[in-house]
């Protein structure tokens, strides 16, 4: 990066740059005097100006490095700032395309698959369809769904074997958690929509939502992409 | 190939009720939401009413809401739409539609059914 | 409610004409656009979903870009068979919608 653009983007007057000193700028009258004074002087000048070089060289990289950090610095904070409304302690990111809901990174389809499709998805993605904890994380969900004709797979499903819906992870519905609205019979699948969560048919084509787990993030300045 | 075939139109009375149907074919009818759309003589297209595939949940135009009623029976494969409270603005030809649930569009439909509401 | 208002109206073209239609909504709907072809006493047929994905069996001539507010279907080569009615609809949000038709009529 030039200097120039370090100065446009910190902005930084350009005057105060290392252009202001430079070998051009020193006395010419230092340079004269009698022949061995002039071998003399010849030489300390030409110690002096390798001694400005050096000292404007080495400042020229100082400055360059202090503005280098300062970039830098600048880029931390406004990512801190841009993360701390969301984030817990321990400097937790979502990917690129994610929405963070509390220890979660959820990510909201725009196309349509059956729940067997939507469930291999998430997995591509390293992820797993929505497993929801209790009413409260439920509610905070539906907050994200911006109209109410529109329906999303969760990692929910009828287990024909068992007779009961079972989450994706193993473990059985909670009937206090969710209050499901249809049949719980074989090749049913659960949705949720703004105000509802739905038995529907898993062969139904809907959207789906996919969660990532949120970690600490160790020694990382910008979010994953 | 899915097919549509909507029946139970006719000339009704104001304030009179009419129920319309709707058979599907040629496809796994519970795994689509469906809908009905209307178009008054000589005019555009105007979305009425859609259900999800299982007929859990079911969604209205204001202008019809509290007056009409979109159902349907999976294992008849048939949809339907009870229609009550009918004013001279309801007449139209009303077509069912498959689909309807954001984002999906209206892919197959049926004829129409006329339905006039006139004193 | 999303408005979707189409023009022109009623334009008149030739068979071979390149004929383009425009659908412009009241806020950004993304690419959440479908496009009907509709004929006189019959019903609507879907031809392009998603702003610019082409229905099975519809042929290639019809094609739709945009997104955001502002769409276009485009004609490359009118064909006799293509005089009729088209509709923009939005499916971002409900209601669902419709542009009021754009009738293409044989100049």
């Known amino acids: 990066m030039d200097q120039q653009a370090i100065y446009a983007e910190l902005n930084l007057p350009t005057d105060s740059g290392p252009e202001s000193s430079s070998p051009s700028s020193l006395p010419r009258d230092v340079c004269q005097g009698s022949p061995w004074h002039q071998f003399a002087l010849k030489l300390s000048c030409a110690g002096i100006i390798l001694l400005v070089l050096v000292v404007t060289g080495l400042s020229v990289s100082v400055t360059s490095l202090i503005q280098k950090s300062s970039i830098e610095k600048c880029s931390v904070d406004i990512q801190q700032s841009r993360n701390k409304t969301t984030e817990r302690p321990g400097l937790l990111n979502c990917p690129i395309y994610w929405q963070q809901l509390r220890e979660k990174c959820l990510l909201f389809s725009h196309t349509v698959n059956p729940w067997n499709n939507s469930l291999a998805d998430c997995s591509t993605k390293e992820s797993s369809l929505l497993l929801i904890r209790d009413k409260d994380e439920l509610i905070h969900t539906q907050n994200l769904i911006r109209d109410k004709a529109i329906l999303f797979w969760i990692g929910l499903n009828f287990s024909l074997s068992e007779k009961n819906w079972k989450w994706i992870n193993g473990s059985f519905l909670n009937s206090n958690d969710l209050e499901i609205r249809g049949d719980a019979k074989e090749n049913s699948c659960i949705s949720i929509s703004q105000t509802s969560v739905y038995s529907e048919y898993c062969s139904t084509e809907i959207r789906w939502i996919c969660q990532k787990e949120l970690t600490p993030v160790r020694n990382k300045v910008y979010p994953d992409s | 190939e899915v097919q549509l075939v909507e029946s139970g139109g006719g000339l009704v009375q104001p304030g009179g009720s009419l129920r319309l149907s709707c058979a599907a074919s040629g496809s796994t009818f519970s795994s689509y939401a469906m809908s009905w759309v209307r178009q008054a003589p000589g005019k555009g297209l105007e979305w009425v009413s859609t259900i999800s595939g299982s007929g859990g949940s079911t969604y209205y135009a204001d202008s019809v809401k509290g007056r009409f009623t979109i159902s349907r029976d999976n294992s008849r494969n048939t949809l339907y739409l009870q229609m009550n409270s009918l004013r001279a603005e309801d007449t139209a030809v009303y077509y069912c539609?498959?689909?309807?649930?954001?984002?999906?569009?209206?892919?197959?439909w049926g004829q129409g059914t006329l339905v006039t509401v006139s004193s | 409610d999303i408005q979707m208002t189409q023009s022109p109206s009623s334009p008149s073209a030739s068979v071979g004409d390149r004929v383009t239609i425009t659908c412009r909504a009241s806020?950004?709907?993304?690419?959440?656009l479908n496009w009907y072809q509709q004929k006189p006493g019959k019903a609507p047929k879907l031809l392009i979903y998603?702003?610019?994905s082409l229905l099975s069996g519809v042929p290639s001539r019809f094609s739709g870009s945009g997104s955001g507010t502002d769409f276009t279907l485009t004609i490359s080569s009118l064909q006799p068979e293509d005089f009729a009615t088209y509709y923009c609809?939005?499916?971002?949000?409900?209601?669902?919608?419709f542009g009021q038709g754009t009738k293409v009529e044989i100049k």
């Open positions: 998603a702003a610019s």
């Open positions: 609809q939005q499916t971002y949000s409900t209601p669902l919608t």
């Open positions: 539609a498959r689909g309807g649930l954001i984002p999906s569009g209206f892919d197959y």
């Open positions: 806020q950004s709907i993304s690419s959440y």
